[in-house]
């Protein structure tokens, strides 16, 4: 039985040409996870695997950085980086948790970081 | 079509060295992490060495550890697999195999095999 | 001799339902995911079941796998003849450090 929560960072606003952390924090579960996949709507940006540690896909390289934690750094941030992210924890025995987070890149410097909420 | 392709393999004497490698495409390459799997004529599936997505972290099994290396090159689409100090043990088929995205969940695609034979 | 220990053979009718065990230890199965392939005469191994249980596309849903604690097993509902495969389990070993398989089950249609 899947017990766990996932805490992300919500809804979250940026400036353009800044730089933004993405977090998910899995809790309530004694699930080991085994690897974190972080994604842009069907996309692959990072892996963090408890064995092999972090891979940030070719494409998201030069702007996509590892941690702090789990998390994923995105910089230089573009109009074009507004959208969903999901952070997919695989657990064992529990199996998969999602989180989501929706960041919107902002061309001004009004961003501000929206309140943290829950996904079960 | 996703595709894993072996090549190198022949016959070596006990000693002799030899170099496999396995040409993938249709997919990106780099997202994944590779083995290396054997099987000896008339037996079963051995795990020989497995690489991460930028070749900084590498497990191989006791059987082969110090006389073969697992490499990579992502600009090329290929992995390799450097056979020194070969045995007739070594005599078998050799399979490149991608794992799912999740490492841990298994081999998902594999190559036709290229058959090495050690002897005199 | 493997770290996963499978049956050496396992055989039945068409239409019949077969289960094919893999036992491990406390390293491997209990903690980790199992995976199950099929190996045609003169072929390269296909994944069957990932994840113990679940089916990538393409795979009949007469394959089904499952886990309870150190042992995991492959059952084979309304057999065909062209099941007659070798079947191997595999699993990462966290001590180990290592994949490791099963010595393999040769199926037989009779």
């Known amino acids: 039985m899947m017990t766990g929560t996932i805490e992300t960072t919500g809804n979250i606003s940026a400036e353009k040409g800044g730089s933004i952390i993405l977090q998910c924090h899995l809790s309530s579960t004694t699930a080991q996870v085994t690897q974190v996949n972080w994604e842009q709507q069907d996309q692959l940006l990072a892996i963090c695997n408890a064995d092999l540690g972090w891979h940030i896909s070719p494409s998201f390289k030069d702007r996509v950085a590892p941690g702090p934690g789990l998390g994923l750094t995105l910089q230089s941030l573009t109009v074009n980086d507004t959208g969903e992210y999901f952070c997919i924890y695989h657990t064992y025995p529990d199996g998969t948790y999602t989180g989501r987070i929706f960041l919107e890149v902002l061309e001004s410097s009004v961003a501000e970081h929206g309140a943290r909420f829950q996904i079960p | 079509e996703v595709q894993l392709l072996e090549s190198g393999g022949g016959l070596v004497q006990p000693g002799g060295s030899l170099r496999l490698s396995c040409a993938a495409s249709?997919?990106?390459?780099?997202?994944?992490?590779m083995s290396w799997v054997r099987q000896a004529p008339g037996k079963g599936l051995e795990w020989v060495s497995l690489?991460?997505?930028?070749?900084?972290?590498?497990y191989y099994a006791d059987s082969v550890k110090g006389r073969f290396t697992i490499s990579r090159d992502n600009s090329k689409n290929t992995l390799y697999l450097q056979m020194n100090s070969l045995r007739a043990e070594d005599t078998a088929v050799y399979y490149c195999?991608?794992?799912?995205?999740?490492?841990?969940?298994?081999?998902?695609?594999w190559g036709q095999g290229t058959t090495v034979t050690v002897s005199s | 001799q493997s770290v996963l220990t499978q049956p050496l053979s396992a055989s039945g009718t068409p239409g019949q339902r077969v289960t094919i065990s893999c036992s491990g230890v406390s390293s491997n199965i209990e903690i980790k995911y199992v995976s199950w392939y099929q190996q045609l005469p003169g072929t390269a191994p296909k994944l069957l079941i990932y994840?113990?249980?679940q089916r990538p596309s393409g795979v009949p849903d007469r394959f089904s796998g499952s886990k309870s604690g150190t042992s995991a097993s492959l059952a084979i509902s309304g057999l065909q003849s062209e099941d007659e495969a070798d079947y191997y389990c595999t699993s990462w070993d966290d001590r180990l450090k290592s994949w490791v398989f099963g010595g393999g089950t040769k199926l037989t249609v009779l």
């Open positions: 249709g997919f990106t390459f780099d997202d994944y992490v």
């Open positions: 690489i991460n997505w930028n070749g900084d972290k590498t």
């Open positions: 195999a991608r794992h799912w995205i999740v490492l841990q969940y298994g081999l998902d695609v």
């Open positions: 994840n113990s249980h």
